[in-house]
């Protein structure tokens, strides 16, 4: 941490004879410089050099040749490397006046003589004189103004609307100044920045809108950082709005939008009069083209229980926005002919949600669904297949008889999906077959008994059993089962014998 | 915090029309299923039906069919259930509930509406 | 419609008692099952969703469990605020239906 320069003569201000010259000495532990009042236009006079000594500090002098009232004012040396924008200069100050007898207030830029004031608050009248020991009041409309006075600043205060006049009177001559107009702003301690995109997503060729509104503030100096800054593509536009309430509407237009305008989109507002900033920021993103994107919340493959409810959502990311479209089996759904429901929502600027919805699930729902997602520049589906699961259920179960061989077939034919398996039991003892367990599993090994089982479609399957010789009477019970459920039935199987002899009698 | 506010109770004549409404707030509207259901004093719960506030499709059950309308006034994130022909044992609190549609389960509830109907 | 059997339909029990209540569907239903909490006057809260998941901010002492037509709710350890009436809810299929209801009374 570098100590603060030192200045030469060591006081803290000066009176400097008219035409005379002075000059101002400034030490420092590193390279210095000087700030003085004049603008360098007005600056012929002054000179700056670096001078060498043995002390091992930097020396920077100023030096003026004719002092005039034009150089009245603030002297500040300080460090280069800590000169920012931001904060006021730090260093070490004198203050110099220049008496005149013909120039009792320091000249001013016009700019000077326009004074605002934020609601209610103080502000200062800069009328310096150029002799400290110079008396001077201030005078509006109404009469003399009572402020206080620094001959280094001005007249301080709370100062209504209006033009003010600062008078001086020097050796017994009266001078006043052009009238100081005080102009109220509105101003809040706190800046109220909103930012506004209605987009943030575009394709080449769009034209990028970003706005930022500043609410009851009238001293705002605003910034846009934005990726097309350095080639200046941003048009910026400040509109005013004063009903109901004062708001300034800046916007930054990047007409023929490219990949390269993607980024940050940033408003930076300064309040003018008060180290006040606020910033807020936004991301746009710039594509070659158009895109969809799908994703489901669910698999290829579905299956849904008969009368179920079941909700399928899609998310869908799009731009531009996409018409989203549901197909069953290739074609159109048609929603008041069925139990099915959609809907599409909007849920952010590019993201869509669609939920296909099933009131009570039926065996016709089963089927291929497609979403189809489509824009100008893209298009995208996604296709599923649900299985409506229906529990099993025998259609029929008959016999068929092989005339004389003795040999007969058992046909049972039973749906449900997934496709049912058949099971086949067998009870010899037909007084006992109302006990459980007097049936038994037919196995497929056995050597007189084939069974076989046959696909119809794809919810329809067939059994038979086939016995080589039945030789007393049987019953055949038919088991169809899968996930959801099982069904049996049984037959009685009667032996050729038996079945000839009931037939004569 | 998603809150569902419910209209103040009614008392109806027989034969009248009740229409609850049910405002939603703390969550996107249209992207969550309104229920109606309706609890008798001292009895249980019995589902009315179900309305999608985006597309304002709807589902009512059985015995409510052709007497329950439910609509929805998107603007104002305002669901909305009506009930004709209304007799002395439709008296009941009536309750919208939001339905998860991740879940497909109620995860929300109104705070309730009494309809008295008494002649 | 499917048919929602609760059990018991009241029940008294101390703070600290573990508690079972039971609801039987007439149907599989999978896992498609909730459980609420209902206090006089007030609406119905949800406890338990997807049969076992334990929605946020309700205690641990709460649980579920079953699939296909048997459910339970287990509140492990009864406490003062647990004085309520719990019912059940499938949404396996329209219509949907709800369990009769199990007030838990103090013993």
């Known amino acids: 941490q570098l100590s603060l320069p030192s200045i030469l003569p060591n006081e803290n201000e000066k009176v400097v004879q008219l035409n005379s010259s002075f000059s101002l000495r400034c030490f420092g532990e590193s390279e210095v410089s000087w700030q003085y009042p004049m603008s360098e236009e007005e600056s012929s006079d002054v000179e700056i050099r670096n001078e060498e000594n043995n002390s091992g500090l930097f020396v920077t002098v100023l030096e003026v040749s004719s002092a005039s009232a034009a150089h009245t004012g603030l002297y500040t040396c300080y460090y280069n490397h800590t000169q920012t924008e931001e904060n006021e200069l730090e260093g070490r100050h004198i203050y110099i006046y220049v008496p005149d007898p013909d120039v009792a207030f320091v000249p001013l830029g016009m700019t000077d003589y326009l004074v605002i004031v934020e609601d209610d608050d103080s502000a200062i009248i800069p009328c310096r004189t150029t002799d400290p020991e110079t008396p001077v009041t201030l005078h509006n409309s109404e009469g003399v103004v009572p402020a206080s006075y620094d001959s280094r600043q001005g007249f301080n205060g709370t100062f209504t609307v209006g033009p003010y006049i600062c008078e001086a009177t020097v050796k017994g001559k009266k001078f006043q100044t052009i009238p100081f107009n005080v102009y109220a702003l509105k101003a809040t301690s706190e800046l109220d920045l909103e930012m506004e995109a209605l987009k943030t997503v575009y394709k080449s060729g769009e034209t990028i809108v970003v706005t930022c509104a500043v609410f009851n503030n009238e001293v705002v100096d605003l910034q846009w950082t934005y990726p097309g800054e350095v080639k200046g593509k941003g048009i910026t536009m400040l509109e005013e709005i004063k009903v109901p309430s004062i708001k300034l509407v800046y916007t930054l237009t990047v007409p023929e939008a490219t990949v390269k305008d993607s980024g940050d989109y940033e408003c930076a507002a300064r309040q003018a009069t008060r180290e006040v900033k606020e910033m807020k920021k936004v991301t746009i993103s710039v594509h070659e083209k158009g895109f969809i994107e799908i994703k489901p919340t669910f698999s290829q493959l579905e299956a849904v229980n008969l009368h179920e409810v079941k909700h399928f959502v899609v998310e869908v990311r799009a731009y531009p926005p996409p018409r989203i479209s549901w197909l069953k089996n290739n074609l159109t759904l048609i929603e008041n002919l069925t139990e099915i429901t959609t809907d599409v929502e909007k849920i952010q600027e590019i993201r869509y949600r669609s939920k296909l919805k099933l009131i009570r699930a039926k065996e016709e729902d089963s089927g291929h669904y497609t979403i189809v997602a489509q824009n100008e520049d893209a298009v995208k589906s996604y296709t599923f297949e649900l299985l409506t699961q229906v529990p099993s259920s025998i259609l029929d179960l008959v016999d068929d008889h092989h005339g004389s061989t003795g040999g007969q077939t058992v046909r049972c034919t039973a749906e449900g999906t997934p496709l049912p398996d058949i099971e086949w039991m067998i009870c010899k003892d037909i007084k006992k077959c109302n006990n459980e367990t007097s049936w038994t599993i037919l196995a497929n090994n056995v050597s007189n008994i084939i069974t076989e089982i046959h696909s119809r479609d794809r919810s329809t399957v067939e059994g038979r059993v086939t016995f080589a010789k039945v030789e007393e009477t049987i019953a055949v019970r038919c088991l169809a089962k899968n996930l959801l459920g099982a069904e049996n039935r049984e037959l009685k199987l009667v032996a050729p014998t038996l079945r000839s002899e009931l037939t004569v009698a | 915090q998603v809150q569902l506010v419910q209209s103040g109770a009614e008392v109806k004549k027989p034969g009248a029309s009740v229409k609850v409404s049910c405002k939603a707030s703390?969550?996107?509207?249209?992207?969550?299923?309104i229920n109606w259901v309706r609890q008798a004093t001292g009895q249980g719960l019995e589902w009315m039906g179900w309305?999608?506030?985006?597309?304002?499709?709807?589902g009512y059950a059985q015995q409510f069919q052709g007497r329950v309308t439910m609509t929805r006034n998107t603007s104002i994130t305002t669901a909305y259930m009506e009930l004709s022909s209304l007799r002395s044992e439709d008296t009941a609190v009536y309750y919208c509930?939001?339905?998860?549609?991740?879940?497909?389960?109620?995860?929300?509830w109104g705070q309730g509406t009494l309809v008295t109907v008494s002649s | 419609d499917i048919q929602m059997t609760q059990s018991p339909s009241s029940l008294s029990a101390s703070v600290g008692d573990r508690v079972t209540i039971t609801c039987r569907a007439s149907?599989?239903?999978?896992?498609?099952l909730g459980w609420f909490q209902q206090k006089p006057g007030k609406a119905p809260k949800r406890l338990i969703y997807?049969?076992?998941s334990l929605q946020s901010g309700v205690p641990s002492r709460f649980s579920g469990s079953g699939s296909g037509t048997k459910f339970t709710l287990t509140i492990s350890s009864l406490q003062p605020e647990d004085f309520a009436t719990y019912f059940c809810?499938?949404?396996?299929?329209?219509?949907?239906?709800f369990g009769g209801g199990t007030k838990v009374e103090i013993k």
């Open positions: 809810l499938q949404h396996n299929r329209y219509p949907l239906t």
């Open positions: 309305m999608n506030p985006n597309s304002g499709n709807t």
């Open positions: 997807a049969a076992s």
């Open positions: 703390g969550y996107t509207f249209t992207s969550y299923d």
């Open positions: 509930a939001r339905e998860e549609y991740s879940s497909s389960l109620f995860d929300s």
């Open positions: 149907q599989g239903i999978r896992n498609n």
